[in-house]
């Protein structure tokens, strides 16, 4: 057993980023930050458990920004972070860092959680040995820590596996039934290999010099470059200097309560289901008793608040604790060119001109589905759409009905009646046609416009 | 502004379903908010059964759990409750209610319905 | 499951008196990480479905009166009538949404 001690520096912009504080126009904030410890070196998504221990720090002090005033190193909280673990310290292991922001203000729901930063290291470590100090840097932040492992009494070792007393102390205190073998005494730590990097090496046994990941050469001096071998296990290759296959770790799967095994260099990882933690999954983890769900998130567990919990977000959030805000305007879902607001609770789009509808769906201007009346037509053009009415009606959708004889269309003092199918004139004596615009000569012939070309006087005359 | 109407029959016979709809208008049930089943017995004992939320995720009361469940037409915009093998202890007044994520509140309550379990 | 008890089961007072309830859950309803009591109280009128009134233990609902004030934190929580009204005839109900929701057995008030 023992503890992974972190201790945050500072959290600020990093070199050229972030001119502006996240504070300014969000009113009073503060920081806090989560630790997260994934046993071996594989790249995990954020999502799947901390197998080895998770801690949340305090809250930091209120801080309200100046909007115009340049970001500082924003105020951090008080104290270490500590991760306690049960089994024998790794050696190897994922440190995820996240930085948050609890939001002060009026809005509903009270206070909100957003996350500033996530930082992912993978990393080598002797438990008992010296703080490793580490800067990062994520998107325009830059987070400067420090962090180590130490064993708790009466473990100690590099992996905390080995038990000791302290000298002339009794074995058991009063009353109690005989203590575990312990070795005779706590020894002093093994005097390394001369030379050996007291940052980048340590050692287990007297006079060796064993690196951290990263670093190389009989005294850890000589940083490496990523082997495309090192996932494989076994005894060393002479042709490739590779490893090859030997019998795997995961033989038996050692992970409990349905964990899934997955072979790491010389060891294996349990990937936990959610609720348990530890090298093999043995260890219950958060619960809805945890009130673990950010963001106004229900708690979904088992039976009772102590069984293994989801958490059902509201809308605009996601992530298995309801704490990554989703762009919901990145799915693009206003169409036809309208701008989407995430307004929080809901999803607004603002059309453009002639367009409607909850998604800018409806084309104003389009014959889809637009209905003209009364026998009228639909005719498109000039990204616009008008009615084209049937005889007696008029009006943007032919709805109205119109007066054939308004326009009083009967020439030459000819009467007009309306009629289902149009008007009829009623011509005055001397005038024909239907709409009385010739007039008739005393002989009886009316005059009428001259023979088109090749018609000889006489011949049946057709007019449009 | 949000209505919520109840709808089903009102005498079930002991050891049937007892199937009921919730009519949402005013707001659309995929958007926000969950939408919640909570019954009161004869004794005013007030019970929550359990909800779908706006993106159609359930959870259910753990005593009612082998019996209940809640799902949704989005189309009609209405949810239900199907509560499988009644006795007579499941007679009550069911209300469908639709509860706010931020306050973790039962914001607004339908008027309720209802049934009676008999032979 | 949480188990929610309320006290007294009911009780009469006369208007213009100041009433208090009291609620108790068998587990805290304190979210460290959102600093919220998840209890919220509701009002039954006779004939109609309940109506929040307090959220977060404390925080009133909008339209609620101010003469009603929740109070409390952890496990026990208290709603408080400065002055009743004839019109606050009602059963009282507090309900914890912690974990899943839980309702309490409620406190009848009469006029």
């Known amino acids: 057993a023992g503890v992974f001690e972190l201790q945050i520096h500072s959290f600020g912009p990093g070199p050229g980023g972030a001119p502006r504080s996240p504070y300014s126009a969000r009113g009073p904030c503060r920081l806090f930050f989560r630790v997260c410890l994934k046993p071996g070196l594989s790249e995990e998504a954020a999502e799947s458990p901390c197998a080895l221990g998770a801690a949340l720090s305090a809250r930091g002090p209120v801080y309200t920004e100046q909007p115009e005033a340049p970001a500082p190193d924003l105020p951090l909280p008080n104290g270490l972070l500590q991760v306690p673990f049960r089994d024998a310290w790794p050696g190897t292991f994922s440190l995820i860092i996240e930085t948050w922001r609890e939001e002060l203000g009026d809005q509903i729901g009270g206070p909100a959680w957003s996350l500033l930063a996530r930082v992912t290291r993978r990393r080598r470590l002797a438990a008992g040995g010296p703080w490793a100090g580490d800067i990062q840097r994520a998107g325009a932040w830059e987070l400067r820590f420090s962090y180590r492992a130490r064993c708790e009494l009466p473990a100690v070792g590099t992996a905390c596996t080995r038990l000791c007393r302290p000298r002339s102390a009794s074995r058991c205190g009063p009353g109690l039934r005989p203590c575990a073998p312990l070795e005779d005494e706590c020894e002093a730590p093994p005097v390394c290999r001369a030379g050996c990097s007291l940052e980048h090496g340590f050692c287990e046994q007297p006079g060796e010099c064993r690196c951290l990941e990263g670093w190389t050469g009989p005294l850890c001096m000589v940083p490496v470059s990523t082997s495309s071998c090192l996932g494989l296990r076994g005894p060393s290759s002479t042709t490739t200097g590779c490893l090859v296959p030997g019998p795997g770790p995961c033989d038996g799967n050692p992970c409990a309560n349905g964990g899934s095994c997955s072979e790491t260099p010389g060891s294996f990882e349990c990937t936990c289901p959610r609720g348990f933690y530890g090298l093999r999954c043995e260890v219950s983890g958060v619960t809805c008793a945890d009130g673990p769900c950010f963001n106004g998130g229900l708690c979904v567990g088992g039976a009772d608040p102590d069984s293994a919990y989801i958490c059902h977000c509201p809308p605009g959030f996601q992530g298995s604790n309801c704490e990554k805000r989703v762009d919901r305007c990145s799915l693009q879902p206003c169409r036809n060119g309208g701008l989407c607001l995430d307004l929080g609770h809901a999803l607004r789009c603002r059309c453009r001109a002639g367009f409607a509808g909850p998604r800018c769906e409806h084309d104003l201007n389009d014959c889809a589905g637009r209905a003209c009346a009364n026998g009228g037509t639909c005719v498109e053009g000039g990204g616009a759409h008008r009615c084209s009415c049937a005889l007696g009606f008029g009006g943007r959708d032919c709805r109205e009905r119109a007066d054939p004889c308004a326009a009083r269309p009967c020439a030459h003092g000819g009467r007009c009646y309306a009629h289902f199918s149009g008007l009829v004139c009623a011509c005055a004596p001397g005038y024909m046609g239907a709409r009385c615009e010739f007039p008739v000569h005393p002989d009886g012939v009316s005059a009428l416009p001259a023979a088109p070309p090749g018609l000889r006087p006489g011949d049946p005359q057709r007019y449009p | 502004d949000v209505q919520l109407q109840e709808s089903g029959p009102g005498l079930v016979k002991p050891s049937q379903s007892l199937s009921l709809t919730c009519s949402v208008t005013?707001?659309?049930?995929?958007?926000?908010?969950?939408w919640n089943w909570i019954r009161q017995f004869p004794g005013n004992k007030l019970e929550w059964m359990g909800y779908?939320?706006?993106?159609?995720?359930?959870n259910y009361d753990p005593s009612l759990k082998n019996r209940i469940s809640i799902t949704r037409d989005t189309s009609k915009n209405q949810f239900f409750l199907k509560l499988n093998s009644v006795t007579a202890e499941d007679t009550a007044t069911y209300y469908c209610?639709?509860?706010?994520?931020?306050?973790?509140?039962?914001?607004?309550w339908g008027q309720g319905t209802s049934v009676t379990v008999s032979s | 499951d949480i188990v929610m008890s309320q006290s007294p089961s009911s009780l009469a007072v006369s208007a213009g008196e100041k009433v208090t309830m009291s609620c108790r859950s068998s587990?805290?309803?304190?979210?460290?990480?959102?600093?919220?009591?998840?209890l919220a109280w509701y009002q039954q009128k006779p004939g109609q479905p309940p109506k929040v009134l307090i959220y977060?233990?404390?925080t009133r609902e909008s339209g609620v009166p101010d003469r009603f004030t929740g109070s409390g934190s952890g496990t026990d929580f208290t709603l408080t009538i400065s002055s009743v009204q004839a019109e606050d005839l009602a059963v009282y109900y507090c309900?914890?949404?912690?974990?899943?929701?839980?309702f309490g057995t409620g406190t009848k008030l009469e006029i």
């Open positions: 209610v639709y509860g706010d994520f931020n306050r973790h509140a039962m914001d607004y």
């Open positions: 005013g707001y659309s049930i995929t958007s926000d908010f969950y």
């Open positions: 779908i939320t706006y993106d159609g995720s359930t």
């Open positions: 587990q805290s309803l304190f979210n460290s990480r959102t600093r919220k009591n998840y």
């Open positions: 977060w233990a404390s």
């Open positions: 309900e914890q949404s912690f974990y899943l929701f839980t």
